[in-house]
Structure formats: structure tokens, C-alpha cells
Interface confidence: low
């Protein structure tokens, strides 16, 4: 008997209020399909009904999480329906507050190497689901390890490619409740470096400024970069400026930090737009130093 | 002017050991990820090991793992490929290349290694 | 691994045809693929870097398009000098692969 595959799209992981289309196909080409949902609430909108092509569930709620398989029509069958099709599970999101993402040592995470991701909450959560943005593949479901501040899971990964970097966000769940899941952690870019040789860092006017005085620093290389991004040592964030091309041949850009108080250690990668999670080897540190007092502090 | 030129190849025994060598002038060798590709004859082209600017990353072909061995000497701006255990299948035109802007953008002019009784 | 499927292994053209050359991913590689030329007794030259980036130097005739498991090298207007062996190379997971080849001759 044809079995048919059911998909869903955008996803299986489904913000609660939203929608998420069901689709249905049999490679026999009927497009009339019956859905079921094996656990979970029931979804009465579901039931004695035919469906073509495609079903459109929402506004989602906790009751619409679980399994779902569809039956398509199947005219040289006894019953008139194919064999069931693959399980899909909905999960939805939203229902509890969301944990926090972090990585371990840090999001930057050399060709190579192995980064560790770390989703905690104060909310006893018994297991975590990590997924990557843009990945239609469920998510990675871990478990969780209990204490009396609430949970928390470690996940270990690499070798550091660009297949692995990306945008993450983790969620939680309880075991009773394991489709219900938490709102997203706030998202995390993993970003794979050294892909690419290190471009120049230098300031104007110079590295050492007077506090309150105005310096840019200029991110340049003979690579055809789209992108630089400027980080400070000890500084979470970077600035990320589109790559300009100059008169010499060198692609450049100029990170304007206007009235400079505090000095820091800077470097500098590029990127390609197309491959936005994938940068270069850093440029050497440059070390940029305040002298004096501004007048106007 | 950027240059490869690799050197080491030659007619080895099956089981025998080889060592390439990849000479790079014209740019900043300790900038740069470094490749090893081999074309056999008659064949394709195929990829057979990276090593990172600083040497903390390599990478090889499941075909060779543990039989070759990838380094470099960023002062000598030299690249090396240390093969044993060699095979018939090993014979091939072996390149150096260097990794830049997403791609393999200058390669050497190649060095024959020929796995023969 | 990564397979890198170049169906077709000899392509017959004229000097002034168009011709396309395709290369499919067996999963995602988002843009990470680059296209090689090789003629006999010459090392590879890079001809696109990121799926649709054209090196320096290399003609305004090669062009590279395609994303996700699809990509495409076409050349238009084709001279005798690009009678040559073309490859396509994936670069988003380790190990690399590289297609098996698509040799472009004379008709």
C-alpha cells in the first residue's frame, strides 16, 4: 500500500497562536488526505474530515501538540485509505517562561574545535530541545539535569564547521507534558572562525586618543569580504559594517566609535553575505588607549 | 606573485613512506588554511587533507586517515604531506592549495607519486 | 559525507554555444561550493567561490548560480581554450568533495 508523507511547514516547532500547514503527499499523486492525532488533547477540527493538498492548523494552542499521521485517498485499497503516513510531532511553544542560552567558552568558535551549549532555567524543566534556525530536521531533544535552582543541560558540540554554526535557541519541557514547550531562549549566533585569512586592523587618528576624542578604526583586506565585524575583548556584541572597495584594491570599513572614555583591546573579522556564520581568522589585537581627562566628562 | 611548487614525489613501494613538500612564496603563508588534493589517473579530483593557519585544525580523507599526516612550518613557509602505508591506489598528481575567500585559489603545479612493484 | 553528483561526464559543444554544467548536493551546503577548471598537464584553476562569486581573472562568460543542493556553472559564448575538465567542490562540511568531473569537448 502507497504510504504518504506528511510534513509541516515552516516547522514542527510551533510558537502557541500561530499557524503551521500540514501537507500530505502520496506518491501515487492523490491529494485527498485524513488526519489523525495519536496523543495528546484531542483537535476536534481534525475529525470525519477530508482535507486537499494541504491543512492549515491555528492559532495553535497547547492542545494542538502530539503526534499527527495522515491517511491519503486510495481508490484500489479495501478501505478506500493508504497505510498511515510517517508521525509528525507539533510541538508548541510558549507555554512556560524561557530558559537561557549560552555558550561556553564563548560564541566564536575557532574551525575546529568544539564549543559548549549551555540552556539553564529556573523552572524544573525535566528535558530541553535545542534547534537551529532554518533547519527543518527536529530538534535535538536533551535531557535535563534537575537541581534546586532549577535545571539546566550542557550539549557538546563539534567539530566546528559551518554545517554547525548558525542561529540557536533552546526550550524547555516536562516529562507529562513533553510537547508543550517552553518560549524560545533568546537566540544565540554560533559563528565558526579561521575559515579565511585575517584581515588589518588600524585607527585614526591613532591608537592612543585623549578621552572624549573622536576614533575610527578601519577593518580592511585584499579578501572579498562583504562584511566586518568589530568586537571589543570582554565585550559580548560586535558592530558589523558592509565592506566598501577602495581605490588601492582593498575592501575596508570604518567603524566610527565616536568620543572614546574607556580603551579596550579591538580585532576585527570578515564574512561573506551568503555564508553569514562563517568568518575569518582575527585581525591582530589592536589595543586602543585614553589618555587624559575630557574636558566636557 | 603567489607560488606553490610541491616536490617529494616518485616511484615508492607498496607500503613504502613519502614525504611531500609545498614551498609558498608571495604571500603571507601563516595567514592562511593549506590543502592537499590528488587527481589519479583517469579520475577526478579529490581532496585529501586541511590544516588550519596555526596547525590547531586538520582535517583528512577517510582513505588516508592515520596513514598520512598533515603539517607546515609557518618561519620555512613550507607545507608538508607525510604518507605511509602507501597503496596502489595512492598513485596520483599531488597538489598543494591554499584556502582563501571560500576556495582553493592558488594551487602548485603538482608532484607525481607512483605506488609500484 | 557529502556527495557532490556531476551527472553528466562528457559535454559536446561549438565554439559560441552556451552550455551549462550542474552539480547536485546530496544535502544542503547552502552557497558553499566552488567550481574548478583543469586542462591536461595544468593544475586547477578557480573559476567561482561561494556558489556565484567569480574569481579574479577569470571571463565574464563563466557563470555560477544555485543554492541549497542545486548549483550550476554556465559558460556562455564558449572559446577552445575552455575545453578543459570542470569540478565542483563543496566546502561546507569536512570532508570536502569534490564532484567526479565534467569534461567539455568539441562536437
Known amino acids: 500500500q502507497d504510504k504518504p508523507f506528511l510534513s509541516a511547514w515552516p516547522g514542527t516547532v510551533v510558537s502557541e497562536g500561530q499557524h503551521v500547514t500540514l501537507q500530505c503527499r502520496s506518491r501515487l499523486g492523490f491529494n485527498e488526505f485524513s488526519l489523525s492525532k495519536e496523543d495528546g488533547m484531542p483537535v476536534p477540527e481534525l475529525y470525519n474530515r477530508i482535507f486537499r493538498n494541504s491543512f492549515l492548523m491555528g492559532p495553535v494552542t497547547p492542545a494542538h501538540a502530539g503526534t499527527y499521521r495522515c491517511c491519503s485517498s486510495h481508490p484500489h485499497s479495501p478501505t478506500g485509505w493508504s497505510a498511515p503516513s510517517n508521525p509528525v510531532v507539533i510541538m508548541v511553544t510558549g507555554v512556560h517562561r524561557k530558559p537561557s542560552l549560552l555558550a561556553h567558552p564563548g560564541p566564536l568558535v575557532k574551525s575546529g574545535e568544539t564549543v559548549i551549549l549551555q540552556c539553564w532555567s529556573d523552572v524544573r524543566f525535566e528535558r530541553f530541545l535545542l534547534h537551529r534556525e532554518g533547519i527543518t530536521e527536529d530538534p535535538l531533544r536533551l535531557v535535563g539535569q534537575l537541581h534546586d535552582a532549577g535545571s539546566q543541560v550542557n550539549y557538546s558540540m563539534g567539530p566546528m564547521t559551518p554545517a554547525l554554526a548558525g542561529t540557536y535557541r533552546c526550550f524547555g519541557s516536562v516529562t507529562h507534558l513533553p510537547y508543550e514547550l517552553s518560549a524560545p531562549s533568546d537566540p544565540l549566533d554560533i559563528v565558526v572562525v579561521g575559515l579565511y585569512g585575517k584581515p588589518s586592523l588600524s585607527a585614526q587618528p591613532g591608537p592612543t586618543v585623549q578621552a572624549g576624542e573622536n576614533v575610527t578604526l578601519s577593518c580592511s583586506s585584499r579578501s572579498l569580504f562583504d562584511i566586518y565585524h568589530l568586537s571589543r575583548e570582554a565585550e559580548a556584541g560586535e558592530l558589523r559594517l558592509t565592506a566598501v572597495l577602495r581605490v588601492n584594491g582593498t575592501f575596508q570599513a570604518n567603524f566610527p566609535l565616536g568620543p572614546v572614555t574607556h580603551g579596550g583591546n579591538y580585532r576585527c573579522f570578515g564574512s561573506f553575505r551568503a555564508l553569514p556564520h562563517a568568518w575569518s581568522d582575527p585581525s591582530d589585537p589592536l589595543p586602543v588607549s585614553v589618555t587624559g581627562n575630557s574636558r566636557n566628562l | 606573485d603567489v607560488q606553490l611548487v610541491e616536490s617529494g614525489g616518485g616511484l615508492v613501494q607498496p607500503g613504502g613512506s613519502r614525504k611531500l613538500s609545498c614551498a609558498a612564496s608571495?604571500?603571507?603563508?601563516?595567514?592562511?588554511?593549506m590543502h592537499w588534493v590528488r587527481r589519479a589517473p583517469e579520475k577526478g579530483l579529490e581532496w585529501v587533507a586541511f590544516?588550519?593557519?596555526?596547525?590547531?585544525?586538520?582535517y583528512y580523507t577517510d582513505t588516508v586517515k592515520g596513514r598520512f599526516t598533515i603539517s607546515r612550518d609557518n618561519p620555512k613557509n613550507t607545507l608538508f604531506l607525510q604518507m605511509t602505508s602507501l597503496r596502489s591506489e595512492d598513485t596520483a598528481i599531488y597538489y598543494c592549495?591554499?584556502?582563501?575567500?571560500?576556495?582553493?585559489?592558488?594551487w602548485g603545479q603538482g608532484t607525481s607519486v607512483t605506488v609500484s612493484t | 559525507d557529502i556527495v557532490m553528483t556531476q551527472s553528466q561526464k562528457f559535454m559536446s559543444t561549438s565554439v559560441g554555444d552556451r552550455v551549462s554544467i550542474t552539480c547536485k548536493a546530496s544535502?544542503?551546503?547552502?552557497?558553499?561550493v566552488a567550481w574548478y577548471q583543469q586542462k591536461p598537464g595544468q593544475s586547477p584553476k578557480v573559476l567561482i567561490y561561494l556558489a556565484s562569486n567569480r574569481h579574479t581573472g577569470v571571463p565574464d562568460r563563466f557563470t555560477g548560480s544555485g543554492s541549497g543542493t542545486d548549483f550550476t556553472l554556465t559558460i556562455s559564448n564558449v572559446q577552445s581554450e575552455d575545453l578543459a575538465d570542470y569540478f565542483c567542490?563543496?566546502?561546507?562540511?569536512?570532508?570536502?568533495?569534490f564532484g567526479a568531473g565534467t569534461k567539455l569537448e568539441l562536437k
Open positions: 590544516i588550519s593557519s596555526d596547525s590547531t585544525t586538520i
Open positions: 608571495g604571500f603571507t603563508f601563516s595567514y592562511f588554511g
Open positions: 592549495a591554499r584556502f582563501y575567500d571560500g576556495a582553493m585559489d592558488y
Open positions: 544535502q544542503s551546503v547552502r552557497t558553499a
Open positions: 567542490l563543496q566546502h561546507w562540511n569536512y570532508p570536502l568533495t
